[in-house]
Interface confidence: low
């Protein structure tokens, strides 16, 4: 027989025994070109002196063999005498040490037995009813396949699974989706309905994130407000990196978790845009306003849980940066202006009602006036800050009011609304003898003292009713008592107290009469 042909004679050895643990196994045969074929197998056991024979039986019952010597691979053409269009049965007989060992048989149609490729190119991954769906284009001329997958997590080894039979131009597989860990998948294919055919190699890794992106464990700190009215938000602790299976380490598209920072400016609600989302790497500058900051984690399946922090407002107040003048037509505020064409947001809120919504007004873009001041006015009818109570006023500025991260704080201060002059008048003025020529004057704190920085001082006025002489005594805003000395016994005096602000003189309290009794000696 010629070596290139299958020899239709009895092989040169005795019958085969298939019961041995050693011997030939894992025979696979397939077409490698339009007219070329290849069979290969494994041999278990010592190889010295072993001769291999590839046996083939046609459907007619005629059998032949190829002698391959010590080789465990054979290539032959469609002219070798083996019917490639009809079903044939193939096996290997290995002869060694006067005994023959036989492999399991493979029955197939050689022409249709193509060496299958694994899924190639782009494998699309999506979520379907709590499972993972993978989809890919069927390799050219390979429609009709059995597909397997294997998968592992960072803490588990490979596990094998079946995708079931595929018979279309696109193939797909439903696989388990892990809730909290990343997975690596690989796929392989073989010809459908051809148990004897060999599996393709495994595909490149497909890296799949957990269904739930990890909760971002980060910490923020916020710097003090700078002279420009802005403070920097800094990340104290980076989010922990997702643990990845071995094949997904390095640049592994598909498992990336992206973290985004969502800023919500709580102050100044009347501005155009209250929320902004930006990458976590871009830590923004903030105004002194109150913010909610959320870190949102997301992966290819969408957003996951977020973590939210509250950044309180910077309550540091500037002394007398704000001027308020009250006229018959209404009230005007003045403050040092920022650059040309700046939009200001003026926000006020009664002190002690921080939970309620602040009143907010947005100015049209304005330029500084000749004195370098910016202004905001309102009429008495509007009722703005009309009640006699303490208001917290904050003014923010931005040249780009729609850009949330470009707002800055101009000032933060307090103002007493309504008729502060009258409302601030001290009450419950009382006079007590202190010594033979002095008295102690006490009063209840002015309502203005509830407003930080508003009350500049108290003034106590004492009038001698005999001579009509008047003396005035300034008192620190934190004090509500003063001692009047050098008084004369038997003379009638009146005492009054008023509370002054930086821009407003208060109204005197009701006059309180007193005199020091003349001491009669025994």
């Amino acid at each position: 027989c010629r070596t290139s042909e299958c020899c239709f004679q009895d092989p040169p050895y005795s019958d085969a025994d298939s019961g041995s643990a050693s011997g030939p196994r894992d025979l696979s045969c397939y077409r490698i070109s339009s007219a070329g074929y290849e069979c290969s197998w494994q041999y278990e056991g010592p190889t010295a002196g072993v001769s291999h024979f590839l046996r083939c039986c046609l459907s007619s019952g005629r059998c032949c063999y190829f002698a391959t010597g010590s080789a465990t691979r054979l290539q032959f053409s469609d002219q070798a005498g083996v019917s490639v269009l009809h079903t044939v049965t193939l096996w290997v007989e290995s002869w060694a040490r006067n005994r023959t060992e036989k492999s399991p048989e493979v029955t197939l149609q050689l022409y249709k037995s193509v060496k299958y490729k694994p899924p190639l190119g782009d494998i699309k991954v999506s979520k379907l009813a709590g499972q993972l769906r993978m989809e890919w284009e069927t390799p050219d001329n390979q429609v009709g396949a059995e597909v397997q997958f294997r998968h592992r997590t960072p803490s588990s080894s490979w596990k094998l699974g079946d995708c079931g039979p595929q018979d279309d131009d696109t193939e797909s597989c439903l696989c388990p989706l892990e809730m909290n860990v990343a997975q690596e998948f690989q796929l392989r294919r073989r010809r459908l309905g051809s148990q004897g055919s060999s599996w393709s190699k495994w595909s490149s890794p497909v890296c799949v994130p957990p269904e739930n992106p990890p909760q971002p464990q980060v910490r923020f700190s916020v710097e003090q407000l700078g002279r420009d009215g802005r403070r920097r938000l800094t990340l104290k602790e980076q989010p922990t990196q997702l643990e990845l299976p071995e094949g997904c380490q390095g640049p592994a598209p598909g498992v990336e978790v992206t973290y985004q920072l969502q800023l919500h400016m709580l102050s100044c609600p009347c501005k155009a845009k209250a929320t902004r989302t930006l990458p976590l790497e871009k830590m923004p500058y903030l105004s002194g306003a109150a913010y909610n900051v959320a870190v949102i984690s997301s992966n290819r399946f969408g957003p996951g849980p977020n973590q939210t922090w509250h950044i309180p407002a910077d309550t540091h107040t500037e002394p007398v940066a704000l001027n308020i003048s009250v006229g018959t037509n209404g009230t005007t505020m003045y403050w040092p202006a920022r650059a040309q064409s700046t939009t200001y947001c003026i926000e006020w809120q009664p002190v002690g009602q921080e939970g309620s919504l602040a009143t907010c007004n947005l100015t049209a873009p304005q330029d500084p006036d000749p004195a370098g001041m910016a202004t905001y006015s309102w009429s008495r009818e509007s009722g703005a800050m009309g009640q006699e109570k303490c208001y917290h006023i904050t003014i923010f500025a931005s040249a780009h009011p729609k850009k949330l991260t470009l707002w800055s704080t101009v000032l933060s201060t307090y103002h007493f609304g309504g008729n502060a002059s009258a409302a601030g008048t001290p009450h419950h003025v009382s006079v007590k003898n202190h010594s033979l020529d002095s008295v102690s004057v006490d009063w209840a704190p002015s309502l203005l003292s509830t407003c930080p920085g508003v009350l500049k001082e108290y003034v106590v006025r004492c009038r001698d009713e005999d001579s009509n002489q008047v003396s005035e005594h300034p008192v620190q805003p934190t004090e509500t008592q003063v001692t009047l000395s050098d008084l004369r016994a038997g003379v009638a005096y009146t005492v009054q107290v008023r509370a002054d602000t930086a821009w407003l003189r208060g109204a005197w309290s009701q006059p309180q009469r007193f005199s020091i009794k003349v001491q009669v000696s025994d």
Partner: antibody, heavy 118, light 107 residues
């Protein structure tokens, strides 16, 4: 056929390092993970870790972290396991084992006896 | 780590006997369990993978069953060449762990 052939026996002093090799043949070396398993005299089997011969990626058992290094040379289809800071209780036969397509160890090397003695 | 226990630790049997060895995992490992045979001075050889699948070339007298935490290896008719130590191993979680072994010797 698949064969995993080890380097010869080694005698080492405590504190030294040993490097054992495992030469693979009969299959495509880079297609299958290689694991290392040791067996102390008269004792059971203990898994040490694996190497992916294709990428060089490794996964070590916690017990050996910091002392074991697994490498490979694909040009000669050989995997290596180096164990440092040897102690007397590291005396064992060290086997390489191939992880098959079904994830289990389908072929084992005959092992290398490493004796640690002062 | 997942603990694997085997029982019995040793057994004596005669040729032709049916032998059963059990293996228990400290937590569920699905069917990621293998059985190995080891003879003195030799490397282990694979008998069963995925709890019940026979490794290529292994005679059908060996069979495996079980899932979750409890597994069994059965030798239907013990032959002289089967006297050896048998180990179970889980390969679902790292680190992979082996049972302590069951030694089968001649009665």
């Amino acid at each position: 056929q698949v064969q995993l052939v080890h380097s010869g026996p080694e005698v080492k002093k405590p504190g030294a390092s040993v490097k054992v090799s495992c030469k693979a043949s009969g299959y495509t070396f880079t297609d299958y993970y290689m694991h290392w398993v040791r067996q102390a005299p008269g004792q059971g089997l203990e898994w040490m870790g694996w190497i992916n011969p294709d990428s060089g990626g490794t996964n070590y058992a916690q017990k050996f972290q910091g002392r074991v290094t697994m490498t490979r040379d694909t040009s000669i289809s050989t995997a290596y396991m180096e164990l440092s800071r040897l102690r007397s209780d590291d005396t064992a036969v060290y086997h390489c084992a191939r992880e098959g397509a079904t994830s289990n160890f389908d072929y084992w090397g005959q092992g290398t006896l490493v004796t640690v003695s002062s | 780590d997942i603990q694997m226990t085997q029982s019995p630790s040793s057994l004596s049997a005669s040729v032709g006997d049916r032998v059963t060895i059990t293996c228990r995992a400290s937590q569920g490992i699905s069917n990621y369990l293998a059985w190995f045979q080891q003879k003195p001075g030799k490397a282990p050889t694979s008998l069963i993978y995925a709890a019940s699948n026979l490794q290529g070339g292994v005679p059908s007298k060996f069979s495996g069953s079980g899932s979750g935490t409890d597994f069994t290896l059965t030798i239907s008719s013990l032959q002289p060449e089967d006297f050896a130590t048998y180990y179970c191993q889980q390969y679902r979680y790292y680190p992979f762990t082996f049972g302590p072994g069951t030694k089968v010797d001649i009665k």
